[in-house]
């Protein structure tokens, strides 16, 4: 389906508003340090050019690829070399190498100031004064901080952001109306970004076979009544959508995502009974709804899997005839029967089944060899079940903050070379699994917990890849996508690690501690905890608990004092000395 002008094709398909939003997101994800005004100028230039191509598809340059057009535009930025250093070298390359070069320079941890939320009245005034600029600023600020954010979904977030302001800036109590909505958008946005980052890592580091396997498992759980051929079609289309978005082809991605939503809604009967309420919604909401749709009910009469995949004498014949199709069917059949399993577990089972067939199909009596293959699954199933059970018990016993601390200690001991901010961020997020998943019924706990942990551990892998410091982290991150979580779980105390020298400055606190929000206070304390473990990796839980309790008491005491700074100056060194003694 070729078009004389790709840019005109996408402009017409998407409409001006979505076209401009997606180009802004694309540019902001590539040039993360550029000022807002610069990006708006570039977007306007691209949009004006697109309009000329809509009017006349054979006009000059309209036949160029989107990568060529966008890359040429990005390379006009005057301060490219000063702001981005070696990224400017990308501009000397030809497509497709130039785009690959830009992709490689995307920064998952850009050095950007945290977003500060202004007063509600200030935000409402800005919203009313220039709604369009206000919403563009939102797209820009999110996209540059999250360079792999799923672009069509970010347009949906922007629509919700706009709706929140439109409603709440009229309300009697603007803050009470707006702030919870903004908090929800922030938290959902961070989760959405992290989930998409795992999809992109899966595609980029492990190839589309890995992503397709993930998609077969997940879609088979969601749509257990759909035929394998239907699931395969959805998987192929979904893979194309995510490959495009992860590759920076945001216009194609959004267009194909809309086509997929259309297809799903036109074929509900052969997909799922749960799609109906999604399909009545407008495009952005519809696509979001379809992505988040709950699992359909499992068909009542599903036969045992053993007949086709263990008892049959034709297993190796079927495997030889089309390995990936046969394994895909196995994964589909297993997943549709097990909404209670995590996707990662299902992929491990498929991998184990494949390994058994590779070994057994070469035997003289394959059937005798693979007859007990399902028994080999038992330990693979029990491992995440036990892990979830133990960690949910610990979470219920400790509460979120102390559960996070337990994980901070656990992970710092495993990989003490990792930077403290990364350990704090990752462990805090790992700790959120408790509140997110442990309250769910048994059948939903494992898919919630393990698939969430995969997303969080991917963040560790992505940050670690930028500055590699631990061979163990590299090994867990690169060897197998599906075994990342078990790999990290299996890590023990790093005996080779040379403890960090004690630095009193790290444990020196000031009166500004008292004005911090509860979350910021927690982060300060957790930073200190990581540093303690790096200094004394063999400290016991009891020792660390004692130090942290003293720390909390010391901070509370000084924050209640009349002269807070004097208290910190006096009590701080005492706390440090007492801590060193306690850990000696």
């Amino acid at each position: 389906d070729t078009h004389k002008s790709e840019v005109a094709h996408r402009f017409k398909d998407l409409g001006e508003e979505h076209f401009k939003g997606l180009v802004l997101v694309a540019f902001s994800q590539y040039l993360q340090q550029c000022p807002f005004e610069e990006h708006v100028k570039l977007v306007n230039e691209v949009t004006e050019f697109a309009k000329t191509c809509v009017a006349d598809e054979s006009a000059e340059n309209c036949d160029k690829s989107l990568h060529t057009l966008f890359g040429d535009k990005l390379c006009t930025v005057a301060t490219l070399r000063e702001t981005y250093g070696e990224m400017a070298d990308c501009c000397a390359k030809q497509e497709p190498e130039r785009n690959e070069c830009f992709l490689q320079h995307k920064d998952d941890n850009p050095n950007l100031p945290p977003l500060v939320r202004p007063e509600v009245d200030v935000m409402c005034t800005a919203f009313h004064d220039n709604e369009a600029t206000f919403l563009k600023k939102y797209l820009y600020e999110v996209a540059r901080r999250h360079p792999y954010f799923y672009a069509p979904e970010l347009l949906f977030f922007a629509a919700r952001y706009k709706a929140a302001f439109a409603e709440c800036c009229q309300a009697a109590d603007k803050a009470a109306c707006l702030l919870p909505k903004l908090d929800e958008l922030r938290d959902e946005g961070k989760a959405s970004s992290a989930k998409q980052r795992l999809k992109c890592a899966s595609l980029q580091k492990f190839g589309d076979r890995a992503f397709k396997a993930w998609a077969v498992a997940r879609l088979s759980q969601k749509f257990p009544k759909a035929e394998f051929a239907e699931v395969s079609k959805l998987v192929t289309d979904l893979t194309k959508v995510h490959t495009e978005c992860c590759h920076g082809d945001l216009l194609e991605c959004a267009d194909d995502r809309a086509d997929l939503a259309k297809y799903m809604c036109e074929n509900q009967d052969s997909i799922s009974s749960k799609l109906k309420e999604c399909c009545d919604k407008p495009l952005l909401e519809k696509s979001h709804c379809l992505a988040e749709v709950e699992n359909d009910e499992m068909p009542a009469d599903l036969p045992s899997l053993a007949a086709d995949y263990v008892e049959s004498k034709d297993v190796c014949k079927n495997y030889a005839e089309a390995k990936d199709v046969f394994l895909g069917m196995f994964l589909y059949e297993y997943a549709r029967r097990h909404p209670d399993y995590s996707v990662m577990l299902l992929l491990r089972l498929a991998k184990a089944y494949e390994a058994t067939l590779e070994k057994c199909c070469a035997a003289a009596d394959p059937h005798e060899c693979y007859a007990k293959v399902f028994d080999e699954f038992q330990p693979l199933v029990e491992e995440p079940q036990n892990l979830v059970k133990q960690n949910c018990e610990l979470f219920e016993q400790l509460g979120e903050y102390k559960f996070q601390n337990a994980l901070l200690v656990r992970y710092t001991k495993k990989v003490p070379q990792v930077s403290t901010p990364t350990l704090v961020e990752v462990s805090r997020n790992l700790g959120k699994v408790g509140a997110k998943c442990c309250k769910l019924p048994e059948a939903k706990r494992m898919p919630c917990a393990e698939d969430y942990l995969s997303v969080v551990l991917n963040r560790l892998c992505v940050l670690h890849e930028k500055t590699p410091v631990s061979e163990k982290v590299t090994k867990c991150c690169t060897e197998s996508l599906v075994n990342r979580r078990p790999c990290f779980s299996a890590l023990e105390l790093d005996e080779a690690y040379v403890p960090k020298a004690f630095n009193a400055e790290t444990f020196t606190f000031h009166a500004d501690m008292c004005t911090l929000s509860e979350k910021e206070k927690q982060v300060k304390k957790q930073t200190a905890l990581v540093e303690l473990v790096k200094h004394k990796p063999k400290a016991t839980k009891e020792q660390l608990k004692g130090v942290m309790d003293n720390f909390a008491a010391f901070v509370e005491k000084c924050c209640k004092a009349d002269d807070k700074e004097a208290c910190f100056a006096e009590e701080g060194p005492k706390f440090v000395a007492a801590s060193q003694a306690a850990l000696a």
């Epitope: 004498k313 034709d314 297993v315 190796c316 014949k317 495997y319 030889a320 005839e321 590779e358 199909c361 070469a362 035997a363 003289a364 009596d365 394959p366 059937h367």
Partner: nanobody, 115 residues
């Protein structure tokens, strides 16, 4: 796609010999155990012999043990069945299969033992 083509069958007198071949394509031949299966007129398939992917492990049905020898040449992607001391009850269509399958996925080759 997977293709198995058998050859070497024919009419032979009792006590005679034949060597059957099965040329394979469309899959990684050396990674799969192979079998010979036969089907006499009006009867179900009967497994005859099997060999592992490397050619080291061979198995035979009691009815052919000591008379038939299975072998393979992975470089040529070919499976063989050397049949000696043939008996009238060996008359059947012989076909090769992947793994332990007894499903017929090819034409097979007719072996007739008669005086």
């Amino acid at each position: 796609q997977v293709q198995l083509v058998e050859s070497g069958g024919g009419l032979v007198q009792p006590g005679g010999s034949l060597r059957l071949s099965c040329a394979a394509s469309g899959f990684t031949f050396g990674s799969f155990g192979m079998s010979w299966v036969r089907q006499a007129p009006g009867k179900g398939p009967e497994w005859v012999s099997a060999i592992d992917g490397g050619g080291a492990d061979t198995r035979y049905a009691e009815s052919v043990k000591g008379r038939f020898t299975i072998s393979r040449d992975n470089a040529k992607k070919t499976l063989y069945l050397q049949m000696n001391s043939l008996k009238p009850e060996d008359t059947a269509v012989y076909y090769c299969t992947i793994g332990g399958s007894t499903s017929r996925g090819s034409q097979g080759t007719q072996v007739t033992v008669s005086s």
